[in-house]
C-alpha cells in the first residue's frame, strides 16, 4: 500500500510479491521522487485499490506497456 508522507509525495516502502493480471489493472503512475526510498510503480486496480510494484520486474513493465497501449487506442 502506498504511503503519503508529506502530501503530495506518495512513496512505496514494500512491493507486492504477487503478479496481478493486467485484466485487473486500470491505470498506473511512476514514483520517481528523490524524497522516496525507492523508485516504484503504483497500479490502480479495477476495484480502485492502489498497489505498489517493483518497476524492475518484467510483469510490471509488461503491464505498464499494455496500459499505455490501451490509453493510446481510441475507444470506438
Amino acid at each position: 500500500q502506498p504511503d503519503a508522507i508529506n502530501a503530495p509525495v506518495t512513496c512505496c516502502y514494500n512491493f507486492t510479491n504477487r503478479k496481478i493480471s493486467v485484466q485487473r489493472l486500470a491505470s498506473y503512475r511512476r514514483i520517481t521522487s528523490s524524497k522516496c526510498p525507492k523508485e516504484a510503480v503504483i497500479f490502480k486496480t479495477i476495484v480502485a485499490k492502489e498497489i505498489c510494484a517493483d518497476p524492475k520486474q518484467k510483469w510490471v513493465q509488461d503491464s505498464m506497456d499494455h496500459l499505455d497501449k490501451q490509453t493510446q487506442t481510441p475507444k470506438t
Epitope: I20, T45, V47
Partner: antibody, heavy 119, light 109 residues
Framework: QVQLVQSGAEVKKPGSSVKVSCKAS????????ISWVRQAPGQGLEWMGG????????NYAQKFQGRVTITADESTSTAYMELSSLRSEDTAVYYC????????????WGQGTLVTVSS | EIVLTQSPATLSLSPGERATLSCRAS???????LAWYQQKPGQAPRLLIY???DRAEGVPARFSGSGSGTDFTLTISSLEPEDFAVYYC??????????FGQGTKVEIK
C-alpha cells in the same frame, strides 16, 4: 479469521424460487467478490456466478443466465443468490466462497446450504 | 468458456505413495490463474494451491502444484490417510467466467 455463514436448508416445490444468504465476518468486503458454486448429489463443483459488491453488478455462468440473481449488501456484508423456476435437477448443496478481485482463487467458503426441490 | 478436463477420474493408491493429478485447459490459462481444492465428504472445498504453484496458508509441503499454459499438475508426494478425497482444479482468468474441472477422486487401494 474470515467466516462465511450461510442460511439454512430449504425444501422447495418445482417452479418456485429460493434465496440463499451468505454473511461475511472477520474481513473487509471492499475489494473482494463472492462466488456461488453448487454441487448436486455425487457430482462435481459448478460455478453459478459471482458479484464484486463495490461494482454492484453480477456475472453469471451461461447455464444459469436468466434464472439466477446474485446480489450483495455492503452495509451488512451479506451476499444473496436467488434461483428461480426450480426443477428437481436443482437439488444440490449451494456454497458461497470469497475471492480477492485482484486474483480469483476461492480462499474462504461457506458451510453450504442444501436446497431440495421436490413435489 | 474455458473447459478444464481432469484425469484420471479416480486414482487408487496406498498411503505413502505419490499421487499425480492432471488438469488440462481448453485454452491458455494466462498468468497461471489456476487453483486446486480438496473436498472431503460432507465438507466444503478447501483451497490448496493458487496461481498454479503457490501453497495456500496451512497447506502441508507434501502438496505441490506445477504447470503453465494448458497443462497443470497437482502432486502429493507421499499420501497421508487424510489426503484421500476429491480434488478439483479451477481457473480464474476472467472474473466473469470461472470454471472447475470435473474432479479426481483419490481413493485407498
Amino acid at each position: 479469521q474470515v467466516q462465511l455463514v450461510q442460511s439454512g436448508a430449504e425444501v422447495k416445490k418445482p417452479g418456485s424460487s429460493v434465496k440463499v444468504s451468505c454473511k461475511a465476518s472477520g474481513g473487509t468486503f471492499s475489494h473482494y467478490g463472492i462466488s456461488w458454486v453448487r454441487q448436486a448429489p455425487g457430482q462435481g463443483l459448478e460455478w453459478m456466478g459471482g458479484v464484486i459488491p463495490i461494482f454492484h453488478t453480477a456475472n453469471y455462468a451461461q447455464k444459469f443466465q436468466g434464472r439466477v440473481t446474485i446480489t450483495a449488501d455492503e452495509s451488512t456484508s451479506t451476499a444473496y443468490m436467488e434461483l428461480s423456476s426450480l426443477r428437481s435437477e436443482d437439488t444440490a448443496v449451494y456454497y458461497c466462497a470469497r475471492y480477492d478481485a485482484h486474483y480469483g482463487e476461492l480462499d474462504f467458503w461457506g458451510q453450504g446450504t442444501l436446497v431440495t426441490v421436490s413435489s | 468458456e474455458i473447459v478444464l478436463t481432469q484425469s484420471p477420474a479416480t486414482l487408487s493408491l496406498s498411503p505413502g505413495e505419490r499421487a499425480t493429478l492432471s488438469c488440462r485447459a481448453s485454452q491458455h490459462v494466462s498468468d497461471a490463474y489456476l487453483a486446486w481444492y480438496q473436498q472431503k465428504p460432507g465438507q466444503a472445498p478447501r483451497l490448496l494451491i493458487y496461481d498454479a504453484s503457490d501453497r495456500a496458508e496451512g497447506v502441508p509441503a507434501r502438496f505441490s502444484g506445477s504447470g503453465s499454459g494448458t497443462d497443470f499438475t497437482l502432486t502429493i508426494s507421499s499420501l497421508e490417510p487424510e489426503d484421500f478425497a476429491v480434488y478439483y482444479c479451477h481457473q480464474y482468468i476472467h472474473l466473469h467466467s470461472f470454471t472447475f474441472g470435473q474432479g479426481t477422486k483419490v481413493e485407498i487401494k
